[in-house]
Interface confidence: low
């Protein structure tokens, strides 16, 4: 079995302000066990956008039912996009650990650009 890959098919997505942005992410394997998270930006200063395991993210919905057996799709939709949402979003797979989950692999990132709202 190939080692898990985190696939973000799009390098960039452009969305008009006020619309929703769909950011796509897929895994190629169910192994290792552990949650996925979405971040904006990389490194220590990255911002958590969505955590599959816990938290409240009112603007984020998942495209697929993440609890569905054998689900490999972790795409998300972010509503009411504003220029402040522009940036590069990373889908990150974590490996279940004790006491803390450990980052396993990141997608290549999808750059979200925000167009002015059509007048």
């Amino acid at each position: 079995e190939d080692e898990l890959q985190v696939i973000q098919p799009e390098k960039s997505v452009s969305v008009a302000a006020g619309e929703s942005a769909t950011l796509r992410c897929a895994m190629t394997s169910l192994i290792p066990v552990g949650p996925i998270m979405w971040f904006r930006g990389a490194g220590a200063g990255r911002e958590l956008i969505y955590n599959q395991k816990e938290g409240h993210f009112p603007r984020v919905t998942t495209v697929s039912e993440l609890t569905k057996r054998n689900n490999l799709d972790f795409s998300i939709s972010i509503s009411n996009i504003t220029p402040a949402d522009a940036g590069t979003y990373y889908c990150v797979k974590f490996r279940k650990g004790s006491p803390d989950d450990v980052e396993f692999k990141s997608g290549a990132g999808t750059e979200l650009s925000v167009r002015a709202k059509p007048s």
Epitope: I7, E10, S20
Partner: antibody, heavy 121, light 107 residues
Framework: QVQLVQSGAEVKKPGASVKVSCKAS????????MHWVRQAPGQGLEWMGW????????NYAQKFQGRVTMTRDTSISTAYMELSRLRSDDTAVYYC??????????????WGRGTLVTVSS | EIVMTQSPATLSLSPGERATLSCRAS??????LAWYQQKPGQAPRLLIY???NRATGIPARFSGSGSGTDFTLTISSLEPEDFAVYYC?????????FGGGTKVEIK
């Protein structure tokens, strides 16, 4: 009936623009991405880009950046592809094709019949 | 960009014979591969997705196999309506890319 109906053939002069439409019926228009794929005479298939009809988000192939614009009108379940600064090598059949929004549902399971765009002086 | 290479370019066979078409990816695309059939003057039609799953309404004589970089489309017994061009396509990586096609023609 689930189908994609495209606009008719076009003949354009070099430097002009063309706008092709693709009307969806029989399914929820906003539930699938719409892609555009072209095929030059006797050649293979070339992906141009997609639009998310729900959000209006777009993603274009690098080759067409700056020349292509994809839009949609959800009120009439129609997607549009406009290609500007046409050249003779843009002569092709242009197809719209739908694709599931989930990254794991990423195949073109429904195609329009194609629109022939001929660029000639 | 992932390069998809199909072989042979042309396959000359008779009705009732078995057709074996190959598709190779320049790097692993896992099982994220589709096969399409295109007849003259028509749009492509999805035959196989995820390397081995038949699309709705596709006859059982069409089957797909493979993973990683090497894939095969097999038509167990050619019917007259199967003579067409077949394309493979990967959608694991951006941008989606198609192979150059294999033409299955009547011998």
């Amino acid at each position: 009936q689930v189908q994609l109906v495209q606009s008719g053939a076009e003949v354009k002069k070099p430097g002009a623009s063309v706008k092709v439409s693709c009307k969806a019926s029989g399914y929820t228009f906003t539930g699938y991405y719409m892609h555009w794929v072209r095929q030059a005479p006797g050649q293979g298939l070339e992906w141009m880009g997609w639009i998310n009809p729900s959000s209006g988000g777009t993603n274009y192939a690098q080759k067409f950046q700056g020349r292509v614009t994809m839009t949609r009108d959800t009120s009439i379940s129609t997607a549009y592809m406009e290609l500007s600064r046409l050249r003779s090598d843009d002569t092709a059949v242009y197809y719209c094709a739908r694709e599931g929004i989930a990254a794991t549902d990423a195949y073109f399971d429904l195609w329009g019949r194609g629109t022939l765009v001929t660029v000639s002086s | 960009e992932i390069v998809m290479t199909q072989s042979p370019a042309t396959l000359s066979l008779s009705p009732g014979e078995r057709a074996t078409l190959s598709c190779r990816a320049s790097q692993s695309v896992s099982s994220y591969l589709a096969w399409y059939q295109q007849k003259p003057g028509q749009a492509p039609r999805l035959l196989i997705y995820d390397a081995s799953n038949r699309a709705t309404g596709i006859p059982a004589r069409f089957s797909g196999s493979g993973s990683g970089t090497d894939f095969t489309l097999t038509i167990s017994s050619l019917e007259p309506e199967d003579f067409a061009v077949y394309y493979c396509q990967q959608r694991l990586f951006h941008p989606p890319t198609f192979g150059g096609g294999t033409k299955v023609e009547i011998k």
